[in-house]
Structure formats: C-alpha cells, structure tokens
Interface confidence: low
C-alpha cells in the first residue's frame, strides 16, 4: 500500500507522458489522477515505466474500479496485464474479440499463464459458446488450447467452429476429448467428397466409432500408421483383417513394427491366424 501524500507543487500530471518516468512511487500515487490514467491507458504502454511504477498505476486503477475495470481500460492495458491476478480478471466483463487479441498479444509466444486462462474463460463464458472467430484467435496464440478444455466445455463448440481447427491443435487431445470433437467434425465436413473429407477428418479420428472406420475402409483412403495408432482400441478391435488392409492401403506393412503396441497388439490377438497370414507380415496372434 502506498502512503497518501500531497502532490508537490507543479508536479500534478496534466497528461500521461514520459515525464512521469522520473516520478517516485509516492509522487505517482499523489500526482496522477486515476480518471486521467483510465482515459489515457493507451499511452502507458509506450512509456518505459519500471515494474514498481506499474504497481502504483495498477493500484490507482484498482481504487477507481473496485468492481473491475471497464473494457475501454482493459483493451489498452498492454503490459500492465502481466500485473493482473486471476482474481482481478474474474471481475472483468470482456466481450470484444479485439480486447482479447490485444491482451493475448502481450503474452504471445509464451506458455498460457493463469491470468490468460482466466481471461479466456471469462471471455468464452460471456459469449456462451466457442464460436469460430474466437477459436481461430485462441488456437493461433495457443495451438494446444482446444485440448486444454474439458469434454463438457468442448460440448459447447458449434460444428461450424471445427473449420478453424488445424491438425496441430489436436496433438495433445485425449480420447475423451476426441469423442466429443469427432461427431462435430463429421457434421462440419459431411458435404465434402471422399479424399478431401479424409484429409479434414483425419486429425479427429481418435474419436471415430467402428462403423465409421469400416466405411472409410471402403474409400481407398490409405490411412498412415500414426493416425491408426491413435484410433480408439474398442473401435479397432471389431475390424476384420481385410478391412484393416483396405484402411491402411500401402501402409499396412507398418503393422509389423507396431505389433507390440496398442491398438495393434490387441487387434492382432482378436484375429484368426489364417487371416493374419494373408498379410504376409509374420504377425502372430
């Protein structure tokens, strides 16, 4: 807490400018009007205040807005955002995607902090669902964002938003998350032709049921082994040797290298040895 002291004569700030850099902490507290600061927040970022000085500026905003900052101030916080706690951010009502982008830009290139996670949570809850523009923005800054959501949270993602998802955005998703996302992707891409559809749906197949894998095996898709290894074991087990051979196409030879790993190991154990022998890979059931 900064002590309340009178502003020295002639030091009252008329505007937020670089002269304030020379003010001591108590002078900033005494001589900078909080309302002036709020209206000229966009200038703060261009002035190289020390972090100690930024603490004072934050304190002034906190006093002016005890119930939480208005969006007009939030949008221009810039590096002052790094000073905010999750508790501060929970008081905000952020509705503009531009505000979200401005604050994510401050943290760009770095791990998602608790502050950013809280900000995103507030923003998405305020919107009611994870729309395409928001998802586009979040995955651009944090490719792993989608996989950080719970299955319950993912259920609010509309199928139209799935078009914004890139393969790398799903790298860290677990089967429960893909179970939620796959039906949405199937719906989103349903009007595409065979080969284009497979390219788009491929990243989501970890959530695909057996009947969809059987259907894909009839379409000459040539699934690679990396994708096959991410399929749900319970979805792979009912597939016949012929169906797996069609599904993988020229990649079927890769089964030998993966014979000790799930789901290949469990699938092999379910097959008749005679059928496995038709692959000519020396797989032993």
């Amino acid at each position: 807490e900064v002590e309340k002291t009178a502003c020295p004569s002639g030091k009252k700030a008329r505007e937020i400018d670089e002269s304030l850099i020379f003010y001591k902490k108590w002078e900033l507290e005494a001589c900078v009007d909080a309302a002036l600061l709020a209206t000229q927040m966009d200038r703060v970022n261009a002035i190289p205040f020390t972090y100690e000085q930024l603490d004072v500026l934050k304190h002034k905003l906190d006093e002016l807005y005890p119930q939480g900052y208005p969006e007009s101030v939030i949008q221009h916080l810039g590096y002052l955002f790094l000073k905010m706690s999750p508790e501060d951010i929970r008081k905000w009502n952020v509705t503009s995607l531009e505000t979200l982008k401005a604050l994510l830009e401050v943290n760009k290139g770095h791990e998602m902090s608790p502050q950013v996670a809280t900000l995103i949570d507030r923003f998405v809850k305020g919107r009611g669902q994870l729309d395409k523009d928001t998802l586009d923005t979040l995955t651009a800054f944090y490719p792993g964002y989608l996989c950080s959501l719970s299955p319950e949270e993912l259920s609010s993602v509309p199928p139209s938003s799935i078009w914004a998802v890139r393969p790398q955005d799903l790298d860290t998703c677990d089967p429960r998350q893909l179970d939620v996302l796959y039906p949405k992707a199937r719906l989103a891409f349903q009007n595409m032709n065979g080969s284009e559809y497979f390219v788009k749906i491929q990243s989501f197949l970890g959530g695909a049921p057996t009947e969809d894998l059987k259907a894909l095996s009839q379409q000459n898709v040539s699934m690679d082994l990396a994708t096959f290894m991410k399929l749900r074991t319970d979805a792979v087990l009912p597939l016949t040797v012929a169906e797996v051979q069609k599904l993988l196409g020229p990649h079927v030879e890769g089964l030998k290298a993966e014979e000790r790993h799930r789901p290949v190991r469990d699938w092999i154990l379910r097959q008749r040895q005679d059928d496995l022998d038709t692959l000519g890979l020396g797989l032993q059931g």
């Epitope: 261009a46 930024l54 790094l82």
Partner: antibody, heavy 119, light 107 residues
Framework: EVQLLESGGGLVQPGGSLRLSCAAS????????MTWVRQAPGKGLEWVSG????????YYAESVKGRFTISRDNSKNTLYLQMNSLRAEDTAVYYC????????????WGQGTLVTVSS | DIQMTQSPSSLSASVGDRVTITCRSS??????LAWYQQKPEKAPQSLIY???SLQSGVPSRFSGSGSGTDFTLTISNLQPEDFATYYC?????????FGGGTKVEIK
C-alpha cells in the same frame, strides 16, 4: 526475423569521439525501447544506456553519464550512441538490444561492434 | 544500485549432467530477472525472462525459478551446445544490472 546490426566501432585515442549506429529490421522499431550493453575484453556484461519508444526519455549508467548520448531515428529504424571524451576503460564490444515487455529483458541482440580506446 | 551476485563463477560438467546456477540480488526484485547465454565471440541470447518464463525457441531443458532475492537457472540434461557463459540480469529498476557470469566448461 528480427535483426540488429551495429556499426561505427574502431580504434580511437583517449579523449576522442565515436558514433555507433544500430540498424534494425524485421520489427516495428518505433514500438520498442532500445538499449546499449557493452562487454570489456574477457569481462562480463554492463548495461550502458537505454531509450524510450519516442526517444523522449533516456537512461545512462553512472560510468558514462555526461559523456555518452543515446538517440534514435524511428523513420530510419536506427539507434545511435554518441560517445565523447572516451577513456581506456570504455574499450569493449558494444551491443544494441531490443527490450521486451515494458522495462523488460532484452529479447534480441545485435552481433556487436568493437570500440578500442588506446593511444 | 542493485548488485547481482552469481555463483559459481565457473563449473565443469559433462554432457547429460544437471547443472544449477544461482543468482542473488542485493534487494528484492520480485520476478523481474532474466537469464542469458553467451558463447565465445557471440552476442548474448535470451533464455529466460520473468524468472521462470522460457523465451520462445529455447529448449525445455532450460528452466528458471525463484523470486525476491534468490534465483536459479537449471539445465536438466546438458548438451554439447550448452557449454557457454550464463548471465543473470535484473530489470526491476534502473540502472539495469547483470551478474558477473558463470562459465560452464567441459569436464
């Protein structure tokens, strides 16, 4: 890709002057505060001077105050260090660096230019 | 001025080792500390900012911790390219100050 390229170093006699330049590319130069850091031969890093985004605020280490002047030309994406009354102890490689968040750490550095002060 | 004291000033280690370098400030600086790596005849490179945040593009074997006055840089699985000199720097207040450096050499 951010690039910072220093120039202007060389051999100068004690009491002489030099002007170092740092040409920046691959970044919005006018949006970042900049700094000069030096390193005497076989020694550690020493912060020399810093300048705000617009150039309106400057900072100096006590050891160079009154002798060195930092400036910038945002239209030319260039940072400068005017060094007067040079002393032997100013001999060093001079690096320009871009400052990160607020008064933050230096996220990009130039390759350095050697200044030798000797008679 | 805030003094930054690094220890050790040098150390010998082997590839695969876990290396720890400490940095102490003469007064509290919150988390406003950076770590840099410098190889001979090269410019320093930023590794860590805000005490523990990894600079973009830096391998995850580097990590930073600490706040207040005591800070640590850890290299968890020393690689041949990690033999270099490491510096800490405070940016809590002016003048900005660096530690004296820690040279990591091959054993």
């Amino acid at each position: 890709e951010v690039q910072l390229l220093e120039s202007g170093g060389g051999l100068v006699q004690p009491g002489g002057s030099l002007r170092l330049s740092c040409a920046a590319s691959g970044l919005t130069f006018r949006s970042y505060a900049m700094t000069w850091v030096r390193q005497a031969p076989g020694k550690g890093l020493e912060w020399v001077s810093g300048i705000s985004v617009s150039g309106g605020i400057t900072y100096y280490a006590e050891s160079v105050k009154g002798r060195f002047t930092i400036s910038r030309d945002n239209s030319k994406n260039t940072l400068y260090l005017q060094m007067n009354s040079l002393r032997a102890e100013d001999t060093a490689v001079y690096y320009c660096a871009k400052r990160g968040a607020a008064v933050g750490s230096f996220d990009y550095w130039g390759q350095g230019t050697l200044v030798t002060v000797s008679s | 001025d805030i003094q930054m004291t690094q220890s050790p000033s040098s150390l010998s280690a082997s590839v695969g080792d876990r290396v720890t370098i400490t940095c102490r400030s003469s007064q509290g600086i919150g988390s406003w500390l950076a770590w840099y790596q410098q190889k001979p005849e090269k410019a320093p490179q930023s590794l860590i900012y805000a005490a523990s945040s990894l600079q973009s593009g830096v391998p995850s074997r580097f990590s930073g911790s600490g706040s207040g006055t005591d800070f640590t840089l850890t290299i968890s699985n020393l690689q041949p390219e990690d033999f270099a000199t490491y510096y800490c720097q405070q940016y809590n207040s002016y003048p900005l100050t660096f530690g004296g450096g820690t040279k990591v050499e091959i054993k």
